[in-house]
Amino acid sequence: MASMGLQVMGIALAVLGWLAVMLCCALPMWRVTAFIGSNIVTSQTIWEGLWMNCVVQSTGQMQCKVYDSLLALPQDLQAARALVIISIIVAALGVLLSVVGGKCTNCLEDESAKAKTMIVAGVVFLLAGLMVIVPVSWTAHNIIQDFYNPLVASGQKREMGASLYVGWAASGLLLLGGGLLCCNCPPRTDKPYSAKYSAARSAAASNYV
């Protein structure tokens, strides 16, 4: 079985990834548009996130507003919302499973069951990581595509915001953490034990005869 250190490392990375997904979800910096004024005082930045957009003045003053309508939002934004929320829920399930299957917890007595639970937790974290990387990469792809598209007005050309980098980091942590937990192999103590048991039983039988 993988060492406890590897297991703790896997859980720690996955939990950090889970927290990063929540941060990525909450931060309104998925797409950024900078409007440079005639002087630095009039420069402004518009941040667009999954739930709201913000206007940031050059003075640092920031005001945010939740989107007016859910129905009128683009499909990719609606899909990103759904995938990131599902990823948070799935990663939460992974955290729960990793606690249950942890070597240093007593939720399960059977070492084999613990190891299997930890592998399931690893797979769950891998799934959560994939669910984050898809919307983040798709948004980045659209931003880059629109940036070089002459049919997209300059006022609609965005840049990649900090949330996308947080999202990539989150998916990396979840995939790495999940991968480490999947390295947990079930204990191989079953076969030697059953062999001893059958041998003992046959000896008893011969004595009876």
Epitope: E48, A72, P74, Q156
Partner: antibody, heavy 121, light 106 residues
Framework: QVKLLQSGAELVKPGSSVKLSCKTS????????MSWLKQVPGQSIEWIGN????????HYNQKFKNKATLTVDTSSSTAYMDLSSLTSEDSALYFC??????????????WGQGTLVTVSS | DTVLTQSPALAVSPGERVTISCRAS??????MNWYQQKPGQQPKLLIY???HLESGVPARFSGSGSGTDFTLTIDPVEADDTATYYC?????????FGVGTKLELK
């Protein structure tokens, strides 16, 4: 360049409906919002609503929620507005516009030439 | 709804500086835009985000303000500037326009 070409003037009877069109070109229609606005000649402008051309999702000014229906045809890059149960108060110049500024922080850069709707018996 | 109050009319001589004001009933941050409309034409965007000049618009036009008080300045005014000027906010839902300020030249 961006072009928005609206349908011609309409003279309609009270209680009837009318469908206005706005044919677009020069931009990626299915990745854009389209807006509709109303102006009574000599008066101010009112925003009716926005439609996202990609999937037809709409966001209306509550005042026009039961009056206007916004639709799009992505194959012809055309936006439509249906006005129902027309009264004399609906007599106005209707503009389609292509907004910039993101999901809801809109300013209207490109405008159609306007369609004059006259409701009269 | 956010009400935008504009002075209804102004008369100035060519070459002068004119300021058109727009006051919002509640804060609109810097989401204030200005349009020029000439008779029989569609509105034309001049200023967006309170102070950003739309491309192709002469530098004679400038905008300022934030929160509830905004101004559009034309310096110097030319004969071609005879039109109605509308302010429009897009921070609060629904997006609203001012009643318009009719600019006439003496």
């Amino acid at each position: 360049q961006v072009k928005l070409l609206q349908s011609g003037a309409e003279l309609v009877k009270p209680g009837s409906s009318v469908k206005l069109s706005c044919k677009t070109s020069g931009f990626t229609f299915n990745k854009s919002y389209m807006s509709w606005l109303k102006q009574v000649p000599g008066q101010s402008i009112e925003w009716i609503g926005n439609i996202y051309a990609g999937h037809g999702g709409t966001h209306y000014n509550q005042k026009f929620k039961n009056k206007a229906t916004l639709t799009v045809d992505t194959s012809s890059s055309t936006a439509y507005m249906d006005l129902s149960s027309l009264t004399s108060e609906d007599s106005a110049l209707y503009f389609c516009a292509r907004p910039d500024g993101g999901y809801n922080l809109n300013w209207f850069v490109y405008w159609g030439q306007g369609t004059l709707v006259t409701v009269s018996s | 709804d956010t009400v935008l109050t504009q002075s209804p009319a102004l008369a100035v001589s060519p070459g002068e500086r004119v300021t058109i004001s727009c006051r919002a009933s509640e804060s609109v941050t810097t989401l204030m835009n200005w349009y020029q409309q000439k008779p029989g034409q569609q509105p034309k965007l001049l200023i967006y985000l309170a102070s950003h000049l739309e491309s192709g618009v002469p530098a004679r036009f400038s905008g300022s303000g934030s929160g509830t008080d905004f101004t559009l300045t034309i310096d110097p005014v030319e004969a071609d500037d005879t039109a109605t000027y509308y302010c429009q906010q897009s921070w609060n839902d629904p997006k609203t326009f001012g009643v318009g300020t009719k600019l006439e030249l003496k």
